[in-house]
Interface confidence: low
């Protein structure tokens, strides 16, 4: 159907599309329309799409009106729910998406006489698809302007954009489905074809002989049989056969006859001949025992000399019968064979629950322990296990004794202590039970026999130098008086412990407080600040390395204090004309002694071995398979004796050679069948069978004959900056920093700076490996002293 | 198709020697690349490799085991056997037996398993 | 050291994808061999070498191995796959084997 809304209508002076007004006069002044609004409502024609609309024609798709819904101006977008300003167009074909539209606005005359007059008209040629969404439209131009909205929605069960798709959801014999936002079919589970009314049969039914009419199921065809209608049906009463067709019966081995009942090696399936006895077939479900001498009968079951195999056990005499032999049996042993034990506990002869055991022709009876002899029938002593363990006596009674307990004992043996401990301990002390009796362990603090006096620990008068002595429980408190301490007031505090004197300041205790004897460069309350000499004593620069000032600490009244431009590593050399050199120590060299000789130039390491400059030193970390101070040895990989079956081995670089013996192949000889298995090529490499011999093929980062040697790569170019050694790691590396430098690539620069080398507020600048100070206004020197 | 079969008693007690032979149907233990091993379970734990033996004689013993045990072969009988001395209760297992190609660590062939249980 | 490391237990919703780790020194030189053991019964050899299967051992069964890990994957995994697995390869020295302590998979 197609709706359509009005929303709006702006008709300000209340005049119609010819200039009238709705109501009649104009007011002579301001000739605006005046007594009563314009009553209006509105009308509707749907056609066919014209690219020029005519007005005139038949509204093809339909036509409508609203009854009166407003006056000159209104809005009705916020009312929802009123059918007034709605007009409904039902159409009962496709939808052909384009369409004209003529929405005129009337003003209703109320009176049957006049006729109703036209406000404004709007006309839209368009273009629209079936939604549940508006189309907001609207008419501006004119006396009047209105505004509304359209849409086309498709019946139940129509879908697409011309509302000619049917879809009606089933779930019956004709189709099981639901649709979806497009109307396509969409089956219920275990259903499908165009119309969903094929069922989906069992996953795995035979699609040749298996059908169902209901999803999951699986119905055979006659002849076949199943879960799955896969399998055959054999003849019926087939015993020891297959079919691979229905009705068929194809016999197993052995099995003959039209249902394969007959056994054509009866022999074989149940062994019938006896003693030793040979069978033989001779026809379906037929044999023949040939007999070993002595035996006789169709299964040479018979013996001839029965008695000559000692047949009867137990020391039973044996007689030959016509059946064969019969047993005589000795006293306590029955049977065919004297084999079986009479049970001389059946009935059982033992009184007073005991236990019948069963002998060789007679019985032993287990009694419980109130009961003795050869049945159980006599009274034991109890008395006599002396079972009473703190008793003045013990009295045997029937089945049964009885102790008669010291005091403080109890129990059927007196061997329980009674308890005498009853909540007689005061002040949580604990009760240790006594015989016939008890004893209070009072916690510390208190005494008494039940615990019951507080100890009053002051009474020794233990606070010393005046202290005043607080009683507690299990405890005493002295309180102090001032400048003394300790549990007992027996410290003069120690306003040195600990120590508040730094930089090596010796600390002394006095009444109430402490005093810090500074060494020479340092001052305040605890020494804890550098001493700026040049204020207090004059100095004296010596030459360029030493500067000189006057002090208590040394006998000749002069303190000589050296620059420490040369760092750890030298020694400040005064030259002429303020300048210095530095004497390095061994393995260093540099204007300020902070280089480290490169121990490595010579190259020493051999065979590919990577050099570690050290101070004065070098250490060699040799390649893979070589060892020694300059990897100069090649390691021996034949020490182990790995050559299998006779094998030669012989040493390679990290490797070894097996020259095989006798057949055997692999890298060990192991092997008859086979050069490769998964130990040949190391660290992932590929082996190849190739006869004779075998091949690795290597992963990325190894070489060698079995991949064991790792390749520089790693190291290719030099991945170490400012330097740096690199030493190759597997298919990685690390790299070796130069002093100065650090991080995995020795790409930081060390702080030189740390920790402050400037003295007077100088400032440092941080180096490769060098520092510079920046003096303050009236400082200089190499560390502005 | 190769089938090992273990025999031997069920029951040891302490400070006896265990004793266990495995038979070898469909395959020969002469065949040239075959390692016959025996490996133990003790009850709700893992898998125990306790040692293997080639057709030549040569042997090789988990460390852990080496000095109370001994694997032996009968080439003729299609046989191999293991002695375990001094046992425990720590030695109550499922023994298996096992063939393993020249991967030596790959046990293609299992016997189904016997329990043997150390208590006086 | 000449051990193998396998987690006690993991488990596996029915149809996901499970993996088992097997670590170890070893495993740098030498491949390891999976085995799948149901309770009351011998162990099974399910992968072994670089990733080879047995005949008879579905292709859901997938090895790899990295470093010195060895991983067992099974991919869609189905309720017969429940069991203990265990992993083991020759020692660093070769000359004796090793096996890992076991991984107990149940799917869900």
């Known amino acids: 159907q197609f709706e359509l809304e009005i929303l709006s209508m702006q008709n300000v002076n209340g005049e119609l599309q010819n200039g009238n007004c709705c109501g009649g006069a104009r007011n002579p002044g301001d000739r605006k329309c005046t007594r009563d609004e314009c009553d209006t409502y509105f009308k509707v024609c749907l056609k066919e799409y014209q690219s020029r609309v005519t007005a005139g024609g038949p509204c093809s798709f339909g036509s409508g009106s609203t009854p009166v819904i407003g006056g000159n101006t209104f809005n009705l977008k916020a009312s929802r729910g009123n059918d007034r300003n709605r007009i409904v167009l039902p159409f009962s074909f496709a939808w052909p998406r384009s369409y004209t539209l003529l929405v005129e606005a009337w003003d209703s005359s109320n009176d049957t006489v006049q006729p109703d007059s036209i406000i404004e008209k709007a006309s839209h040629s368009g273009m629209i698809n079936p939604s549940r969404q508006w189309q907001t439209l609207k008419q501006n131009t004119g006396v009047a302007h209105f505004e509304y909205q359209i849409r086309v929605t498709c019946d139940d069960y129509y879908y697409g954009f011309g509302c000619n798709k049917f879809c009606r959801p089933r779930d019956d014999f004709f189709g099981h489905y639901a649709c979806d936002q497009n109307g396509n079919k969409t089956c219920m589970e275990g259903w499908m074809g165009p119309e969903c009314n094929r069922a989906i049969c069992r996953q795995g039914c035979s699609p040749k002989h298996g059908s169902c009419k209901l999803p999951g199921d699986c119905r055979c065809q006659y002849g076949w049989q199943g879960l799955y209608c896969d399998k055959c049906i054999p003849h019926p009463g087939c015993v020891h056969g297959i079919c691979n067709e229905p009705w068929q019966c194809l016999c197993e081995t052995n099995w003959g006859g039209q249902l394969c009942d007959k056994d054509l090696n009866y022999c074989g399936t149940h062994q019938p001949c006896l003693n030793g006895g040979t069978c033989s077939n001779t026809g379906p479900d037929k044999y023949q025992c040939s007999c070993p001498e002595g035996y006789s009968g169709p299964n040479c079951e018979i013996a001839e000399h029965a008695c000559l195999s000692d047949p009867c056990h137990n020391r039973g005499s044996c007689k030959e019968t016509s059946l064969g032999f019969e047993c005589e049996c000795s006293p306590g042993w029955t049977g065919p064979t004297c084999s079986t034990n009479i049970d001389d506990c059946s009935p059982n002869n033992c009184s007073h629950g005991g236990t019948c055991q069963d002998l060789v022709n007679g019985f032993k009876c287990v009694c419980p322990p109130q009961w003795t002899g050869k049945t159980c029938q006599l009274d034991a002593n109890e008395c006599e296990a002396k079972p009473c363990v703190n008793a003045k006596s013990c009295k045997n009674l029937i089945a049964s004794y009885y102790c008669d307990c010291l005091p403080g004992w109890m129990g059927q043996n007196c061997d329980i202590n009674i308890n005498d401990c009853l909540g007689q301990c005061q002040n949580d002390a604990s009760c240790r039970d006594l015989v016939n009796g008890y004893r209070c362990i009072c916690p510390p603090g208190y005494a008494g026999d039940h615990c019951e006096r507080d100890i009053d620990e002051c009474a020794s008068n233990p606070c010393l130098n005046g202290g005043h002595c607080q009683n507690e429980i299990n405890r005493f408190q002295c309180l102090c008086p001032t400048g003394f301490s300790g549990n007992l007031c027996q410290l003069d505090i120690d306003y040195c412990e600990p120590n508040p004197c730094q930089n090596g300041a010796q600390c002394y205790n006095r009444a109430s407080d402490y005093f810090c004897k500074c060494p020479e460069d340092y001052e305040g309350k605890n020494c804890s600040h550098l001493k700026d000499h040049c204020r207090t004593t004059p100095c004296e620069v010596i030459d360029s390395c030493t500067v000189a000032m006057a002090s208590n600490d040394t006998p000749e009244g002069v303190r000589y204090i050296s620059s420490n431009v040369c760092g750890p590593h030298g020694k400040c050399k005064s030259q002429s004309g303020g300048k210095f050199t530095c004497d390095c120590n061994k393995g260093f060299t540099g204007t300020y002694c902070h280089e480290n000789i490169n121990d490595c130039e010579s190259n020493p390491c051999r065979n590919g071995g990577t050099c570690i400059d050290g101070v004065n030193s070098y250490k060699c970390i040799c390649s893979d398979g070589w060892e020694g101070a300059y990897c100069e040895t090649n390691i021996n990989d034949c020490s182990q004796n790995p050559c299998h079956n006779g094998g030669t081995c012989r040493d390679l670089v990290n490797d070894f050679y097996c020259d095989c013996k006798n057949g055997w192949k692999g890298k060990t000889c192991h092997s008859r069948d086979s050069q490769c298995d998964e130990a040949t090529c190391n660290n992932g490499g590929t082996c190849y069978d190739e006869g004779d011999a075998f091949k690795c093929m290597c992963p990325g980062g190894w070489e060698g004959t079995t991949c064991n040697i790792a390749r520089n790569s790693s190291c290719l170019p030099n991945p170490c900056h400012n330097g740096g050694t690199c030493v190759v790691n597997g298919e990685s590396f690390t790299c070796v920093c130069k002093e100065g430098w650090e991080g995995p690539i020795c790409a930081q620069n060390t702080n030189d700076c740390s920790p402050h080398p400037c003295y007077n507020s100088g400032t440092c600048v941080d180096g490769d490996n060098w520092y510079r100070c920046e003096c303050a206004p009236g400082f200089a020197g190499p560390d502005c002293r | 198709q190769v089938q090992l079969q273990e025999s031997g008693p069920g029951l040891v007690k302490p400070s006896e020697t265990l004793s266990l032979t495995c038979t070898v149907s469909?395959?020969?233990?002469?065949?040239?690349?075959?390692?016959w091993s025996w490996i133990r379970q003790p009850p709700g734990k893992g898998l125990e490799w306790i040692g293997y033996?080639?057709?030549?004689?040569?042997?090789n013993y988990n460390p852990s085991l080496k000095s109370r045990v001994t694997i032996s072969v009968d080439t003729f009988k299609h046989q191999f056997s293991v002695n375990l001395t001094s046992v425990t209760a720590a030695d109550t297992a499922v023994y298996y037996c096992a063939r393993s190609g020249v991967a030596m660590a790959r046990f293609d062939y299992w016997g189904q398993g016997t329990l043997v249980t150390v208590s006086s | 050291s000449s051990e193998l490391t396998q987690d006690p237990a993991v488990s596996v919703a029915l149809g996901q994808t499970v993996r088992i780790t097997c670590q170890g020194d070893s495993l740098r030189t030498y491949y390891a061999s999976w085995y799948q053991q149901k309770p009351g019964q011998a162990p099974v050899l399910v992968i072994y070498?670089?990733?080879i299967r047995p005949s008879g051992i579905p292709d859901r069964f997938s090895a790899s191995r990295s470093g010195n890990t060895a991983a067992l994957t099974i991919t869609g995994a189905q309720a017969e796959d429940e069991a203990d697995y265990y992993c083991?390869?020759?020692?660093?020295?070769?000359?004796?084997?090793?096996f890992g302590g076991g991984t107990k998979v149940t799917v869900l």
């Open positions: 083991n390869s020759r020692d660093s020295s070769g000359d004796h084997v090793i």
């Open positions: 033996i080639y057709y030549t004689g040569s042997t």
């Open positions: 469909g395959g020969s233990v002469s065949s040239g690349g075959d390692y």
């Open positions: 070498g670089k990733n």
